[in-house]
Amino acid sequence: AGVFELQIHSFGPGPGPGAPRSPCSARLPCRLFFRVCLKPGLSEEAAESPCALGAALSARGPVYTEQPGAPAPDLPLPDGLLQVPFRDAWPGTFSFIIETWREELGDQIGGPAWSLLARVAGRRRLAAGGPWARDIQRAGAWELRFSYRARCEPPAVGTACTRLCRPRSAPSRCGPGLRPCAPLEDECEAPLVCRAGCSPEHGFCEQPGECRCLEGWTGPLCTVPVSTSSCLSPRGPSSATTGCLVPGPGPCDGNPCANGGSCSETPRSFECTCPRGFYGLRCEVSGVTCADGPCFNGGLCVGGADPDSAYICHCPPGFQGSNCEKRVDRCSLQPCRNGGLCLDLGHALRCRCRAGFAGPRCEHDLDDCAGRACANGGTCVEGGGAHRCSCALGFGGRDCRERADPCAARPCAHGGRCYAHFSGLVCACAPGYMGARCEFPVHPDGASALPAAPPGLRPGDPQRYL
């Protein structure tokens, strides 16, 4: 799990002739807001398909009124980032659509009117956890400058947010098949992804794909308090007699999408899939013509001279989609061998090879351990096109150069003191406890430094010790 973050830096006239008219005027003051839509980049989806990775809407920007006779400047922007949370793995390659919307603040009947000013789209490769990436996109005579990044939400780490770093389950080592998390040698890397949507507060998992509930919570995603789990109706008003917590109407109830658009629920709200010729949050924007510059990436717009006739975008080589907003994915043929990463640079394909492989298509297998030294008595282990060091006791990291602190994971229970030792660690137990890690109270119902059974707990109840 993690968050995709988008920072809009500027929106204004692009370079070159034909500066656009200001979208606002003294008669019609307006303000801008932005919408971002994300889709997994390797899926061959139409431009109108739902935002499978998520979508977000910015706040409204400051009100702007054009100064008479002045060229359209960069327009005032909303504050803050646009954040799109994603629940599962970050796909690495993604498609985006960023829409700039104008909200007119005149005296129209029925409140403010919205209209789409510009729409840019693209496809990018991005690793989670990396630095901000800067971008410039043009739509007609407008230019949008922005930065974006993807970051993982703890405890997820890695370029796809699929690795989890958790405190060690066992005191002295990671479980079978689990490695220490570099550089956090006191934590274990677990290839553990709980069921999508599993409550981070009330659920946990010990095996991938499961969602186990902490005491007092139930339901498939551990989101229902135990006292409220006897509800039968899937949706409807709350029942005073049963105390059921029942969700209210769904975001798609009554279909908020206009002009024949179809509605699909998203984790945060809803998404409208619009028929051709309609756009906007609720498919309320119509009458797009070639004058609006709807074809991206150098596409040629044909037809659509008046709002009642559809336009067609003739796309240049390498692009497709009804608005030429999608780059043709030549990487879908998987030309890179041995797990190499395919990069479509537009003018050429490039393969980024995994460690241990080389060649234009990563076709050459190298000796993984050749020239690789493991420090501090570690031994090199070949396999899977990457070398790995099996480190001597007390050392960790990729090349065994990091000294592991055996006490960092608080391996001594019940207030025991941990001491690093040349052979590992030693626990000095608090009075009344024993065991290699002080995990066993000697007399659990007697007086001891930390009582093992606080009053009111029955056998079988969990008790917490720090």
């Epitope: 405190p167 060690r168 946990f204 010990e206 010790y465």
Partner: nanobody
Framework: EVQLVESGGGLVQPGGSLTLSCAAS????????MAWYRQAPGKKRELVAG???????MYIDSVKGRFTISRDNAKNSVYLQMNSLRAEDTAVYYC???????????WGQGTLVTVSS
Amino acid sequence: EVQLVESGGGLVQPGGSLTLSCAASGSRVSFLSMAWYRQAPGKKRELVAGISADGSTMYIDSVKGRFTISRDNAKNSVYLQMNSLRAEDTAVYYCYAYRWTTRLTYWGQGTLVTVSS
């Protein structure tokens, strides 16, 4: 939540043998430190034997050489093999678990062992 269910208790003559079982659910026993405790009538509950998450074992002096604690990861269970039983071993035997991920302790409901001729 970890749940522990003991079984195997009963009546046995002095010098006899008995094996207690503790079946765990809600977590893998390989990730738990587990122990057997006993409580004789009118006495405090006391630790008998323990097995840490890393597999190391420990015993109180009065049972060393007679009792053996073991773990079967496949069956998600912990056992206490009791040989050369004595009358003073008569007690309710409880299974105990310490879960390292949450630092919570759990108890079973107990099983009665009576050593009598």
